[in-house]
């Protein structure tokens, strides 16, 4: 009866098609989630840059469903996974098709979470337990962080740690997606 | 752990404005959803406004709309409650209250130890 | 603006149960208005005992249980102790909203 198939851990991942699967159409919604959107033209010296803004890092999209104990999300959430190295923008696999990965011999820049968002989620529960509902966090934008020799590679992996920590997607920045328009995404790609 | 520090008591008089402060510790203010609440002397709870991560912005109650402002310095990690046009019947002990910063987002679980604001001629 | 309703005042005896309960004006209390539940003491700051209808936190005794009953929000304290005399808010979220009940005076004698 259970949902032994599922990770109690909210962290079951349904992969999309493709290696890096886009993001689904933007809908006709003023509220529009927030992507990283800090390309722009590559430094004249990359090394020498203090301006993180002109790195950019991939996100990659998940779908997934949400776990809470035997619980599991009526639908599955989409949401982002930073991934790869930082480099300039254009230089970048998803900037360009055919770029090559640059591997950067200066300053250790690290893709990461960088804002995120809140969605409602309704979780249904086996053995006749009554449903919950819930908000649940999700990354709403990834960012290049430049690390120093004092960031340590536990940061890396711990998005708890203060490298690493989700920011919320505040204005003037763009709005984070609503949740009314994540499900109504959420409903026309499946 | 978060932790909330507020301003100290303010005396105003009507027509006046006054802003309260909210200092966190522990984490950014950039990382948690920050709202305000406020109670009268033997009166309830009531809600102002706060930051409301699904649509990313910070938002009011209708009561209060146009008469209060909410702002974050995130270079001091500070919050700011404005109140203007206070009445008499705005003094109260106003409090900010946080979310926690874990992978469910519930609010309201750190609490500042409250700001007395007496409104009086 | 919605209203939200609570018993005004509540008795328990020490080791009684009792069911606090939270109603909207804009009719059945579901899930979806995430009700939360604070207590607070006298000279204190509010604190969380439950969101979410019925999570409790780290911090909430066992003896307090959040739910839904006929058509409201409800918190039951089951095995009251003396120091759990105190006001006892509801609090209900309309979309991003939030809207507080009057709260109830809880007396354990």
């Known amino acids: 009866q259970g949902w032994q198939a599922f990770k109690n851990d909210a962290t079951e991942i349904i992969p999309e098609l493709g290696e890096y699967p886009e993001p689904p159409p933007e809908l006709e919604n003023n509220k529009t989630m927030n992507r990283a959107e800090n390309g722009g033209r590559p430094p004249h010296h990359p090394f020498e840059t203090k301006d993180v803004s002109e790195y950019s890092c991939r996100e990659l999209h998940f779908t997934r469903y949400v776990t809470d104990g035997p619980c599991r999300s009526a639908k599955p959430v989409t949401e982002l996974v930073c991934s790869g190295q930082c480099g300039p923008a254009r230089l970048l696999p998803n900037a360009i098709g055919r770029g090559k990965w640059w591997r950067p011999s200066g300053p250790d820049f690290r893709c990461i979470p960088d804002r995120y968002r809140a969605q409602r989620v309704q979780l249904l529960c086996p053995g006749g337990e009554a449903p919950r509902a819930r908000k649940v966090r999700l990354v709403a934008s990834c960012k290049c962080k430049r690390l120093t020799r004092f960031h340590n590679q536990s940061e890396l992996k711990d998005f708890g740690t203060e490298a690493a920590r989700p920011q919320k997607g505040r204005k003037p920045r763009p709005r984070a997606r609503s949740a009314k328009a994540n499900q109504a995404e959420l409903e026309n790609a499946y | 752990e978060v932790q909330l520090v507020q301003s100290g008591a303010e005396v105003k008089k009507p027509g006046a404005s006054v802003k309260v402060s909210c200092k966190v510790s522990?984490?950014?203010?950039?990382?948690?959803?920050m709202h305000w609440v406020r109670q009268a002397p033997g009166k309830g709870l009531e809600w102002m406004g706060g930051f409301d991560p699904e649509d990313g912005e910070t938002i009011y109650a209708q009561k209060f709309q146009g008469r209060v402002t909410m702002t974050e310095d995130t270079s001091t990690d500070t919050a700011y409650m404005e109140l203007s046009s206070l009445r008499s019947e705005d003094t109260a002990v106003y409090y900010c209250a946080t979310d926690t910063v874990g992978y469910w987002e519930k609010f309201f679980q750190h609490w500042g130890q409250g700001t007395l604001v007496t409104v009086s001629s | 603006q919605a209203v939200v309703t609570q018993e005004p005042s509540l008795t328990v005896s020490p080791g009684g149960t009792v069911t606090l309960t939270c109603g909207s004006s804009?009719?059945?209390?579901?899930?979806?208005?995430?009700p939360y539940w604070f207590q607070q003491k006298p000279g204190q700051a509010p604190r969380t005992l439950i969101s979410?209808?019925?999570d409790k936190h780290s911090w909430t005794p066992a003896r307090f249980s959040g739910s839904l009953l006929g058509g409201k929000a409800a918190l039951t304290l089951s095995g009251a102790q003396p120091e759990d005399e105190a006001e006892y808010y509801c609090?209900?979220?309309?979309?991003?909203?939030?809207?507080f009940g009057g709260g109830t005076k809880l007396t354990v004698l």
């Open positions: 804009t009719g059945t209390v579901t899930i979806d208005h995430y």
């Open positions: 522990g984490y950014t203010l950039t990382e948690l959803s």
């Open positions: 979410d209808t019925d």
């Open positions: 609090l209900l979220d309309y979309g991003g909203r939030f809207v």
